[in-house]
Amino acid sequence: DAHKSEVAHRFKDLGEENFKALVLIAFAQYLQQCPFEDHVKLVNEVTEFAKTCVADESAENCDKSLHTLFGDKLCTVATLRETYGEMADCCAKQEPERNECFLQHKDDNPNLPRLVRPEVDVMCTAFHDNEETFLKKYLYEIARRHPYFYAPELLFFAKRYKAAFTECCQAADKAACLLPKLDELRDEGKASSAKQRLKCASLQKFGERAFKAWAVARLSQRFPKAEFAEVSKLVTDLTKVHTECCHGDLLECADDRADLAKYICENQDSISSKLKECCEKPLLEKSHCIAEVENDEMPADLPSLAADFVESKDVCKNYAEAKDVFLGMFLYEYARRHPDYSVVLLLRLAKTYETTLEKCCAAADPHECYAKVFDEFKPLVEEPQNLIKQNCELFEQLGEYKFQNALLVRYTKKVPQVSTPTLVEVSRNLGKVGSKCCKHPEAKRMPCAEDYLSVVLNQLCVLHEKTPVSDRVTKCCTESLVNRRPCFSALEVDETYVPKEFNAETFTFHADICTLSEKERQIKKQTALVELVKHKPKATKEQLKAVMDDFAAFVEKCCKADDKETCFAEEGKKLVAASQAALGL
């Protein structure tokens, strides 16, 4: 499979348009602060060079690895030292250390301005004036803010982004057509970014084995009719794709993802009956569709798992011969029978099974020792079931905003050292589990809820890793990937926390709050709630709810006032004074 010129090979496989887009994404994900024009210039230079290699694979430098070519190009940026500080030191290293160095400097929370959406007419004019630049700018802005965004999927988003403008800029009511589509793309994009971030964290922090275990469980749920060998092949290929994308090898990743989609569609009959529609679509849509495809029906009359994994006298022999293969088969068999379980639960069960075999296969009577292993699964299954039941009841009682507030209080009390913006962002996302998953029937609730929570808690983990402030967060994030959620759930109020000093400025509000969107207004209120809990961690739920209700009434009253600013100043002081007196701030 060796090619004289890797860059020529990828250019020919992907085509010029995708090649340029993927190089732009790669560069923007590495150098997140560089201006758009600088990246476009670098991409054009790389593209021109790739074309010379396509014409003559033996031309000078065409035999160099993509990391060498791209790294050399990134290191030509004049302002590297003043813009990125110590990242510039990466350029003194040789490959592969240089690329590893660039990867380590990816910033999950870059200091970039919030993307403000211009007026629809302004956007449509820009789209018509220069469609290519407009779409490149989209790729650039998303990639630099989401340095682990799944690159081939970002091409799919860009295609939908283009389609939205093509359709809506000709519509009678441009805004009514365009804005809902852009909102949908934004929300789906954030979700896609967070899901991919978990895959990369899984690979980078816990290794290939952890990712493969996750993939075996998920693909076995999705393709329960496929043989174990087929699932194993898909897992191997999928692991390669994600390892490449998470490692910044975006051209190889996109190419291999296309090959995997092609293979899946050519072998639908032995994989899943649900793939037919997906496989009729063009490449980007096809890959996206396969990744989101619903679970196939379980084969009828699957035998009991106990026969092969508990009752058989060959359990320890089979385990000893090929431990990971045997555990993989256990995970495959369990997962295909349980689309109603979360992937992380299935992985906990597999880990329990592995631990039991490790202990029992060394015992005097192995069978006697592991005979009751399935009984150990019961509490592991019941814990997430009960938690989801309780939280869905709370969500249905409170609604999303107040459910988020309950989680804000809960998590601020658990880990009050975490920054307020991170607590607000993470708790708001945790709270979205209600509207996302509680509407589902029992059989779909757990996979929806617990696997979503894994994605959100990973956001907390990657944000906290940048500036660690809490040993408890570090512990829950690093000890076990599959036990992160139970670890956070088990955290009680941090009794060692010293309450934050009271700062009146934190609780001072102005008339600008009246012009904010409902979402932004909620975030302001939730920010105040977190700060309140940090000042008064012993405040009861009732007291905190009362303060929030007072705050809502205060904002409503002052936003209706003739002199809003005076109202905010005077009534704000009174509210702080009343809260201080009642809570002893």
Epitope: A546, D549, D550, A553, A582
Partner: nanobody
Framework: EVQLVESGGGLVQAGDSLRLSCAAS????????IGWFRQAPGKAREFVAR????????DYANAVKGRFTISRDNAKNTVYLQMNSLKPDDTAVYYC????????????????WGEGTQVTVSS
């Protein structure tokens, strides 16, 4: 003159329902959070429920959650407490209170108090 007048109390059987009313006058009703408190013989006065100036913002003591519902009608300057599935433990004098801040209400403080209405639940 500020007045809060409670009505609707009485003697009922366990499991029955009652609806208490609190009629306010002499102040700008819509600017105040309203709470219901109760005091059983020989016991301290305790918080039952409250409604903020924004009618949807309510809260309840754990003992009454799911059984009692508080609501307000600003046009009539009245607050209601719908009490269902009453228990003998609910026997008390029920007081209505008005306060500028919810946070003071939950700590048992208020600007204005009513005289109370007796609720007796027999088993």
């Amino acid at each position: 003159e500020v007045q809060l007048v409670e009505s609707g109390g009485g003697l009922v059987q366990a499991g029955d329902s009652l609806r208490l009313s609190c009629a306010a006058s002499g102040f700008t009703f819509s600017n105040y959070a309203i709470g219901w408190f109760r005091q059983a013989p020989g016991k301290a006065r305790e918080f039952v429920a409250r409604v903020s100036t924004i009618a949807g913002d309510t809260d309840y003591a754990n003992a009454v959650k799911g059984r009692f519902t508080i609501s307000r009608d600003n046009a009539k300057n009245t607050v209601y407490l719908q009490m269902n599935s009453l228990k003998p433990d609910d026997t008390a004098v029920y007081y209505c209170a008005a306060e500028s801040y919810n946070v003071r209400l939950v700590t048992g403080e208020a600007d204005y108090w009513g005289e109370g209405t007796q609720v007796t639940v027999s088993s």
